[in-house]
Every structure is written in structure tokens, then in C-alpha cells.
């Protein structure tokens, strides 16, 4: 769930890496309340995920490796 450019809460679903084309990170500040990873999916959706959860870290690590190879 997001409000303008801010994630307000985290998804309760697990996404597969094949579904994700990229991500951006949201840092908690005066505009946005929570830290979040925003996954960008192949369907053009933005999904707010908890950066502390293992499945999120795994995908971020996998995508970061891909980006570093390019």
C-alpha cells in the first residue's frame, strides 16, 4: 500500500524473483513513516515489502548482483 510515493504498510504476500524487474528503497523520514523496499513488477505494480524479512533480502541481493554484472 502506498500513498503518493510513500509505502504505508507492507505486503503480506511473498513474490517470486521472476515477477520483479527492479526495486527502490524507501527510507523513513519526515515524509515517509517506514523503511521499505518497493518492488516493481512485470505487471507495472509497485509492491511495498519489509526490508527486514528474509525473502525480501534474498530478492534484493539477487537483483543487486544482476545490476552489478551489467
Amino acid at each position: 500500500a502506498s500513498n503518493f510515493d510513500c509505502c504505508l504498510r507492507y505486503t503480506d504476500r511473498i513474490l517470486h524473483p521472476k515477477f520483479i524487474v527492479g526495486f527502490t528503497q524507501q527510507l523513513a523520514n519526515e515524509t515517509c513513516d517506514i523503511n521499505a523496499v518497493i518492488f516493481h513488477t512485470k505487471k507495472g505494480l509497485s509492491v511495498c515489502a519489509n526490508p527486514k524479512q528474509t525473502w525480501v533480502k534474498l530478492i534484493v541481493r539477487r537483483l543487486s548482483k544482476k545490476i552489478n554484472k551489467m
Epitope: 511473498i14 513474490l15 517470486h16 521472476k18 527486514k52 524479512q53 528474509t54 534474498l58
Partner: antibody
């Protein structure tokens, strides 16, 4: 070798709760998810939910939300699935299955199954 | 939720036959699909992961193919031990829904 050993068969009355255990061995317990899947007599497979033993994160199928609780005891490499407010339709074999994100999020090892019978 | 539809629901075949089971997703699942085999009274066993990859110890007569919404499992030459029920499963996004199953019987 990888083994998932589940607790024994249970008979419960409608309205009661059941807690099924799944003890893992032969691998690093916190490196893999644990799913719960059930199968009613003569029916297909139904995914109930998953727990990540590394951080106790859970996500459940909508159908079971509010009735199912999955927990983990890392000291004994055991995962538990508790289902409450049992009804006759919950009569099924309940399986735990290891979720391996290294092989496309597949369930690569399964427990032997636990038959839960709900009957008055 | 993503719905998985398997066809046929049952199939009679003979030893040596080539058999194909299909699975259709209600939306594109980008190859995030697994196949399992289950024999009566036993737990399911992983056959194929990621739509096309053979799981460890699975004979090469089994193969998976497909993309988008349409996937298939093929057994190139049926062996007596292959008579069982087969399930596909979506793992793109939770809930990880299964197909209804295909029961493969001896003709």
C-alpha cells in the same frame, strides 16, 4: 539426509483445536521455509501457508486466516501448525514441506503426513 | 488469487505411451510453476521446478515446458511406476495454488 518427521494422527471434536508438529533434520533449518499443505480424503492439494524459520515470518491462505497459526522452535528444528475452530471439512492429511528458494521456490522435501479426523 | 486449471482430470494410458498433461494459469505466471507426483497413501514428490527443470533423481523421461499462462508435463515413455496423480503449482505469488490434479491410470 533431509528428513521431515510429523506427529501422529489426531481425532478431534468440532470446535476444538489441533497442533501438528514437523521436526526437520539433515539440513540447516533456518535456511529454508516450511509450508503446510493439506489434502482432504480423495481430494487435491491445498496450500495453507508458510513460515520462514529464520525470522518467523508467516503468510497464510485467506481461507485459513484467523484460524491457523504457524510457529517455529529453532532450538529443536521443529515447526508447528495449529488449526482452531475445527469442523468436519477440516478432516484431511496435513503435510509439512520444505520450501527451497534455490529450486524456484519449490517444495522439495515432504513430511509423511498427519491425518486429522474431525468427528463428533 | 491465481487459479490453476489442469487437464485432463484423468487419463488412461499404457506402458510405453507418451503422455502430456497441461496446466493453465488464470494469468501470466512467468514460468514460476512446479510439478509434483503423488502415489496413493504417500506424500507428493517434486518432479519439475521453474517450469522446465528436472528435480534431483527424477528420470529424464519426464520433461516440463511452457510459458505465460500455459504449461505442460510430458512423460516420453510411461513406466509402471509412473501411474500416479500429478499436480501443478503456481509459486509466482502467495497463495501458492495447486491445480486440481491429473490421475494417470493404466489402460
Amino acid at each position: 539426509q533431509v528428513q521431515l518427521v510429523q506427529s501422529g494422527a489426531e481425532v478431534k471434536k468440532p470446535g476444538a483445536s489441533v497442533k501438528v508438529s514437523c521436526k526437520a533434520s539433515g539440513y540447516t533449518f533456518t535456511n529454508y521455509w516450511m509450508h503446510w499443505v493439506r489434502q482432504a480424503p480423495g481430494q487435491g492439494l491445498e496450500w495453507m501457508g508458510v513460515i520462514d524459520p529464520s525470522d518467523s515470518y508467516t503468510t497464510y491462505a485467506q481461507k485459513f486466516q484467523g484460524r491457523v497459526t504457524m510457529t517455529v522452535d529453532t532450538s529443536t528444528s521443529t515447526v508447528y501448525m495449529e488449526l482452531s475452530s475445527l469442523r468436519s471439512e477440516d478432516t484431511a492429511v496435513y503435510y509439512c514441506a520444505r520450501g527451497n528458494y534455490g529450486v524456484d521456490y519449490a517444495m522439495d522435501y515432504w513430511g509423511q503426513g498427519t491425518l486429522v479426523t474431525v468427528s463428533s | 488469487d491465481i487459479q490453476m486449471t489442469q487437464s485432463p482430470s484423468s487419463l488412461s494410458a499404457s506402458v510405453g505411451d507418451r503422455v502430456t498433461i497441461t496446466c493453465r494459469a488464470s494469468e501470466n505466471i512467468y514460468g514460476a510453476l512446479n510439478w509434483y507426483q503423488q502415489k496413493p497413501g504417500k506424500a507428493p514428490k517434486l518432479l519439475i521446478y521453474g517450469a522446465t527443470n528436472l528435480a534431483d533423481g527424477v528420470p529424464s523421461r519426464f520433461s516440463g515446458s511452457g510459458s505465460g499462462r500455459q504449461y505442460s508435463l510430458t512423460i516420453s515413455s510411461l513406466q509402471p511406476e509412473d501411474f500416479a496423480t500429478y499436480y501443478c503449482q503456481n509459486v509466482l505469488i502467495t497463495p501458492y495454488t495447486f491445480g486440481g490434479g491429473t490421475k494417470l491410470e493404466i489402460k
